[in-house]
Interface confidence: medium
């Protein structure tokens, strides 16, 4: 029951997380003009991964897409890629995890298969969450270091000489949505991996019944169960994974190469 709850909760948390990652990726407010210390203007600028917008004090809002691909900063492209990879992995993970849910019966799918699928989706959620967190963090770092859109090139009246001034941009709502969503997806993935450990069918060890007849002992091995080697056998429970049985102590940890945070 606890395993089903853990799996179900992991799925729901991951679902919310991935929805958040999608929302963050689509949002326009990745960076917003800092209103705290700016000269007076009726214009408020903010930018997303796909377009930049202007909102005026009258309420009028106008957005313009980044119609160029080659002209965009490499870091912005990298953030886009990380977010899209996160969404794709998360979506596949959700699809896999639906079939892995213990509360859903699909034909005669064995628990071992569900365990595998739960583990796969869990890993996908973890990587998806890491991608989102990495993407948002890279963008936040760009803002902090004024790496992207940090200067406004204005022309003065002095024969077209270029004048550069720092534009004050601060963290937009999308960054916080992305961080939270990435964290939720990561937590959901961990919960799925934990649920996987309890999903695998346990190797039930039955003690053989000895019948004393004709002066010699015969160990009766009931069909369909693994035979015991005797009364003094190792009764430690084992989980069966695809690719061989391992004890709990032998379960491999999966090192993540997405070591951004």
């Amino acid at each position: 029951m606890a395993v089903t709850a853990c799996q179900g909760l992991g799925f729901v948390v991951s679902l919310i997380g991935i929805a958040g990652i999608i929302a963050a990726t689509c949002m326009d407010q990745w960076s917003t003009q800092d209103l705290y210390n700016n000269p007076v203007t009726a214009v408020f600028n903010y930018q997303g991964l796909w377009r930049s917008c202007v909102r005026e004090s009258s309420g009028f809002t106008e957005c313009r897409g980044y119609f160029t691909l080659l002209g965009l900063p490499a870091m912005l492209q990298a953030v886009r890629a990380l977010m899209i990879v996160g969404i794709v992995l998360g979506a596949i993970g959700l699809l896999v995890s639906i079939f892995a849910l213990k509360c859903i019966r699909i034909g005669s799918m064995e628990d071992s298969a569900k365990a595998n699928m739960t583990l796969t989706s869990g890993i996908m959620f973890i990587v998806s969450g890491l991608c989102a967190i990495a993407g948002v963090s890279v963008f936040a770092n760009m803002l902090v270091t004024n790496f992207w859109m940090s200067t406004a090139n204005m022309y003065t009246g002095m024969g077209g000489m270029v004048q550069t001034v720092q534009t004050r941009y601060t963290f937009g709502a999308a960054l916080f949505v992305g961080w939270v969503a990435g964290g939720l997806t990561l937590i959901g993935g961990v919960m799925m991996c934990i649920a996987c450990r309890g999903l695998a069918p346990e190797e039930t060890n039955y003690k053989a019944v000895s019948y004393h007849a004709s002066g010699h002992s015969v160990a009766y091995k009931p069909g369909g169960f693994k035979a015991s080697t005797g009364f003094g056998s190792n009764t430690k429970n084992k989980k069966i994974y695809d690719g061989g049985a391992r004890t709990e102590d032998e379960v491999q940890s999966y090192p993540s190469k997405h070591d951004y945070v």
Partner: antibody, heavy 119, light 107 residues
Amino acid sequence: QVQLVQSGGGLVQPGGSLRLSCAASGFTFSSYEMNWVRQAPGKGLEWVAYITGSGRTMYYADSVKGRITISRDNAKNSLYLQMNSLRAEDTAVYYCARYWNYAGGMDVWGQGTLVTVSS
Amino acid sequence: DIQMTQSPSSVSASVGDRVTITCRASQGISSWLAWYQQKPGKAPKLLIYAASSLQSGVPSRFSGSGSGTDFTLTISSLQPEDFATYYCQQANSFPLTFGGGTKVEIK
């Protein structure tokens, strides 16, 4: 060459109307907020009106509110000041100026056009 | 509305002199103050923005300082072409307002 060229000034009777124009060149006009500033003979500078790049938001000085309208045509790279119900005190040299909203200053100015309100 | 008060209204100085013009705002305007130079019959020219940043192409003898309500424009060594009228302008809130101007004349 970044510049603002003004036209439309002249002599007008009290209560009359006049439309000033300001043609921009050398920069992306629609990206900039613009202002009209005036200077009465022998007096200091007085801000008159402000308009955003889209032309959707405007601000006016109390002294001209209801009588003056600022507008722009981004397709023509032009800024306008429609002046109605003109008074003697509106006599001044009118300047159009580009507002540099990251610095809070007006970095490009037109050459000015004289509006004289007299009977 | 924010009132801008400039002083003195006029100053007589010689070439090479150090000239200081002050501008006081009726309420705090952070550092959003611009300084302009205007010569007779000409349009104003932006000298200083954000209280202390020198506009491109403006000689380094011009400098600005101050924050909040009190601001200063300093011409370290007055040149013949610097004789003009100087205006301050606040950019903290609408309506934008200018100081009354300071005329720098030849002594």
